[in-house]
């Protein structure tokens, strides 16, 4: 017997062949003998089965003695034994149809779990293999589960059923839900407008839902919201923002916020949650800033950062085209007495200058300049 | 040649009935089903029904359900068309035709035309 | 049942015009759909079945194609012996319906 396998919405043909190359009466049975389709003479005749209106045929093939049965819009239930009669002989083929469903929705937010559920026909014993957009194999039975969802998992995942040595394939789309980057840090010298973008890591028609940024500030005890604000199909409103400081909010995407000046008191970080509507869980993203200030006060030049910064950074105070005057793994550096000329405070990471900020000393009798 | 020879035209009154005959020769009578088809003056074509004579088996439009009767004489090769309650609306030209399961209705009778008229 | 529409319902046309005439179905009927010619007094000729089969003895000039709903007759040039009616008729689904005809005229 043929073993045909189909899946779940799609339109399988199983075919029947005479020996005789012309049209001649030919009919189509289940397995409990309800005729399904045939015909009489040239005509078309359809049967009193479930598959009444999703049957079909194609009438430019029977001439050539083929008879297809075409069943449209496949069920699990359509799994069965079909019979062909033609020219007093039968043809059995039967007919498997599988169907491959992700739990609930396709769009994921990143670190939820995917669970596909494979539908079959009783009595079947299938496997089911599936690769990931990054090349990833899950194997399994009736259900797969990957936790803990990546980016890097969002597009096109490919799973082969297999059922008696044949084998179907499934495509379906996965999003995953995320913000492009989970961190991010801005550098800025004090005074400086500071611009937070949030972009993200996908596109849907219609994106709806709230947003909050919180923020601890490294000179505060506590966090504090800084703004409140909604999504409604891409387009975006603030519903609540701080007095200090005021910050402004983009109304298209991506989500993007602006600090109009860096403060040593706003340093610190933040943490931009993202609720969408009709998915549980949230969007988050990290976002640091790291302010510097350099001073000179009577005969003492200091330079400053604030902020969350990595023990490995230095900061250098230095002399326009000398060397380094001081250079320290700390938060602060100062130098006495410091000659008159340009000189450069730099925040830097392995050699590459992160922040930079420069102050004139004047000589003695002068006040000092801050370009 | 395949040929289908019909009866000669009638004259009905309403309420009345008529039965159209339709002789095959030329071919196997048993091996083609028997369509019927309606033409009124100045009008389209009408699909009434169908007969396969081996075994008599019919299919009839919903449309005259109950009123036409399609039957065949394998032994005279003949097909026949009753149908009954005629009305003024049935004045029309009635063709038997031949349909091969090759070709659908590749042989036509000369076509009968039939008046009710009180 | 299905029903058949024919466009256009009357057509005027010259010989050596390519001509087109259309026939929509109600439902899918797959490639179930015949064409006929008629001329007056006369019994229908079976010119295409299965949608694009020419019926043996007719000239090619007349082509037929579509699947699913949509459906179209061609006479490619057009001869004096073409001006007739045109009829569809779907085999898909009983009551085998026509289309309302098309008359096909000289200009």
């Known amino acids: 017997k043929k073993v045909v396998l189909g899946k779940k919405g799609d339109t399988v043909e199983l075919t029947c062949t005479a020996s005789q190359k012309k049209s001649i009466q030919f009919h189509w049975k289940n397995s409990n003998q309800i005729k399904i389709l045939g015909n009489q003479g040239s005509f078309l005749t359809k049967g009193p089965s479930k598959l009444n209106d999703r049957a079909d045929s194609r009438r430019s093939l029977w001439d050539q003695g083929n008879f297809p049965l075409i069943i449209k819009n496949l069920k699990i239930e359509d799994s069965d034994t079909y019979i062909c009669e033609v020219e007093d002989q039968k043809e059995e083929v039967q007919l498997l149809v599988f169907g491959l469903t992700a739990n609930s929705d396709t769009h994921l937010l990143q670190g939820q779990s995917l669970t596909l559920t494979l539908e079959s026909p009783p009595g079947s014993s299938p496997s089911v293999q599936c690769r990931s957009p990054r090349g990833k194999n899950i194997q399994g039975g009736k259900t797969l589960s990957v936790s803990q969802l990546e980016l890097q998992d969002s597009g096109t995942w490919t799973c082969t059923v297999l059922q008696n040595q044949k084998k179907v394939e499934f495509k379906i789309d996965i999003v995953v839900l995320a913000f492009q980057k989970a961190s991010s840090i801005v550098y800025k010298k004090e005074g400086e407008q500071v611009e937070f973008s949030f972009p993200l890591a996908f596109t849907v028609e219609k994106l709806t839902g709230s947003g909050e940024l919180w923020w601890q500030a490294e000179r505060a005890s506590s966090s504090k919201s800084w703004i409140t604000f909604d999504l409604k199909n891409k387009e975006v409103s603030v519903k609540r923002v701080t007095q200090d400081p005021k910050l402004q909010m983009g109304k298209k995407l991506p989500l993007h916020l602006t600090l109009p000046q860096a403060l040593p008191q706003y340093a610190g970080s933040g943490n931009l949650t993202l609720a969408l509507e009709a998915k549980t869980g949230k969007l988050h993203q990290e976002v640091n800033l790291v302010v510097m200030r350099a001073t000179q006060l009577q005969k003492n030049l200091t330079c400053e950062v604030w902020g969350p910064t990595s023990p490995k950074l230095m900061l250098s105070l230095k002399l326009e085209n000398k060397e380094a005057k001081v250079s320290k793994r700390e938060k602060a550096v100062w130098v006495l007495n410091p000659e008159a000329g340009m000189w450069q405070c730099l925040l830097s990471d392995s050699g590459q200058v992160l922040l930079e900020s420069n102050i004139k000393v004047l000589p003695t009798w002068s006040t000092p300049v801050q370009p | 040649q395949v040929q289908l020879v019909q009866s000669g035209a009638e004259v009905k009154k309403p309420g009345s009935s008529v039965k159209v005959s339709c002789k095959a020769s030329?071919?196997?009578?048993?091996?083609?089903?028997i369509h019927w088809v309606r033409q009124a003056p100045g009008q389209g074509l009408e699909w009434m029904g169908m007969?396969?004579?081996?075994?008599?088996?019919?299919t009839y439009a919903q449309k005259f359900q109950g009123r036409v009767t399609i039957t065949a004489d394998e032994s005279t090769s003949t097909a026949y068309m009753e149908l009954s309650s005629l009305r003024s609306e049935d004045t029309a030209v009635y063709y038997c035709?031949?349909?091969?399961?090759?070709?659908?209705?590749?042989?036509w009778g000369q076509g009968t035309l039939v008046t009710v008229s009180s | 049942d299905i029903q058949m529409t024919q466009s256009p319902s009357s057509l005027s046309a010259s010989v050596g015009d390519r001509v087109t005439i259309t026939c929509r179905a109600s439902?899918?009927?797959?490639?179930?759909l015949n064409w006929y010619q008629q001329k007056p007094g006369k019994a229908p000729k079976l010119l295409i079945y299965?949608?694009?089969t020419l019926q043996s003895g007719v000239p090619s000039r007349f082509s037929g194609s579509g699947s699913g709903t949509d459906f179209t007759l061609t006479i490619s040039s057009l001869q004096p012996e073409d001006f007739a009616t045109y009829y569809c008729?779907?085999?898909?689904?009983?009551?085998?319906?026509f289309g309302q005809g098309t008359k096909l005229e000289i200009k």
């Open positions: 035709a031949r349909d091969s399961s090759g070709y659908p209705i590749d042989y």
């Open positions: 030329g071919y196997t009578f048993i091996t083609s089903y």
């Open positions: 007969i396969n004579p081996s075994g008599g088996t019919t």
């Open positions: 439902h899918h009927i797959s490639d179930f």
């Open positions: 299965a949608a694009s």
């Open positions: 008729q779907q085999s898909y689904s009983s009551p085998y319906t």
